[in-house]
């Protein structure tokens, strides 16, 4: 199997950003959990959320109220999440880490860009 994501996700300031992470596996493969983290050079990873096949979505304190699953219907192989109300400080690199059975673990990174639209008054 392999992970499908985007290299870059671009949203306008204040919009919700969908962070895609889909496991395209062989027949019979299952996703046990998907962990999302923000990754910055030299800082390690800051945990965002964990999607667990048994225990559901858990969101870390720093992102409480800001991370959700996309609305149903949901595919059990889809580990995508929504980051609500994107701000400029959210701009950076994110990683999804997917634990599957029986194929093992996979990870993929994407960059989130947050566009600030300046209004010009004439």
């Amino acid at each position: 199997g392999e992970l499908e994501t985007s290299d870059v996700v671009t949203v306008v300031l204040g919009q919700d950003a969908k962070l895609p992470c889909f496991y395209r596996g062989d027949s019979g493969e299952q996703v046990g959990q998907v962990a999302w983290a923000r990754v910055d050079a030299g800082e390690g990873a800051q945990e965002l959320a964990l999607l667990h096949s048994k225990y559901g979505l858990h969101v870390s304190p720093a992102y409480e109220g800001r991370v959700e699953q996309p609305p149903p219907p949901r595919n059990p192989l889809d580990g995508s999440v929504l980051l609500r109300n994107a701000v400029q400080a959210d701009e950076g690199e994110y990683e999804c880490r997917v634990s599957t059975f029986p194929a093992g673990s996979f990870q993929a990174r994407l960059r989130l860009r947050v566009l600030v639209h300046h209004h010009h008054h004439h």
Epitope: Q33, A35, D40, G42, E43, G44, A45, Q46, E47, L50, H52, Y55, H58, S60, P61, A62, A89
Partner: antibody, heavy 116, light 107 residues
């Protein structure tokens, strides 16, 4: 490299006050919740307090509620724990800790001794 | 508040042997469980989070398992630097709570 360095511990009389500080470096301080955890001599780890990333919200263990105040200055990358009405049972090493959901980085601790 | 109970309080083990430490939660903590190692005079160090994920730089001889209320930390092939106190902690609910610790000592 992530570093947390506590200071401000010392000997204080019962009923007295002390302010602990924790200087953070090596990470984007303003993005992380932070905690204080304490450990009495020869005892286990006990969570004391937490503060959210912008300093607008804090919570406390029942044993220190109303006596301790946790604050932060994100411009200075520094945490503060103001401890008032100190009691003998507050004697402990106080660690400042980074919250990454789990507690991934700990300072070396500062010893607070409350004794007459 | 969730009460975390560790057993045994002290575990005598010979170097090279396996150590098995237990941690029980008074209610389900899902998989939001971490293990820490603490040596005398030092700060605790994160070993494992999410029940079974080793923190950066932690050797493969440390492994974690379990879910819900029952958890285990296994140290296979104990080395001299592994003799320490080990704490479990739940981060599923507020307040965060720790077990009382298990001291792994030389047999």
């Amino acid at each position: 490299e992530v570093q947390l360095v506590e200071s401000g511990g010392g000997l204080v009389q019962p009923g007295g006050s002390l302010r602990l500080s924790c200087a953070a470096s090596g990470f984007t301080f303003s993005r992380y919740w932070m905690h204080w955890v304490r450990q009495a001599p020869g005892k286990g780890l006990v969570w004391v307090s937490r503060i959210n990333s912008d300093g607008s919200s804090s919570n406390y263990a029942d044993s220190v509620k109303g006596r301790f105040t946790f604050s932060r200055d994100n411009a200075k990358n520094t945490l503060y724990l103001q401890m008032n009405s100190l009691r003998a049972e507050d004697t402990a090493v106080y660690f400042c800790v980074r919250d990454n959901w789990y507690f991934d980085y700990w300072g070396q601790g500062t010893l607070v001794t409350v004794s007459s | 508040e969730i009460v975390m109970t560790q057993s045994p309080a002290t575990l005598p083990v010979s170097p090279g042997e396996r150590a098995t430490l237990s941690c029980r939660a008074s209610q389900s903590v899902s998989i939001n469980l971490a293990w820490y190692q603490q040596k005398p005079g030092q700060a605790p160090r994160l070993l494992i989070y999410g029940v079974s994920t080793r923190a950066t730089g932690i050797p493969a001889r440390f492994s974690g398992s379990g879910s819900g209320t029952e958890f285990t930390l296994t140290i296979s092939g104990l080395q001299s630097e592994d003799f320490a106190v080990y704490y479990c902690q739940q981060y599923n609910n507020w307040p965060r709570t720790f077990g009382q610790g298990t001291k792994v000592e030389i047999k």
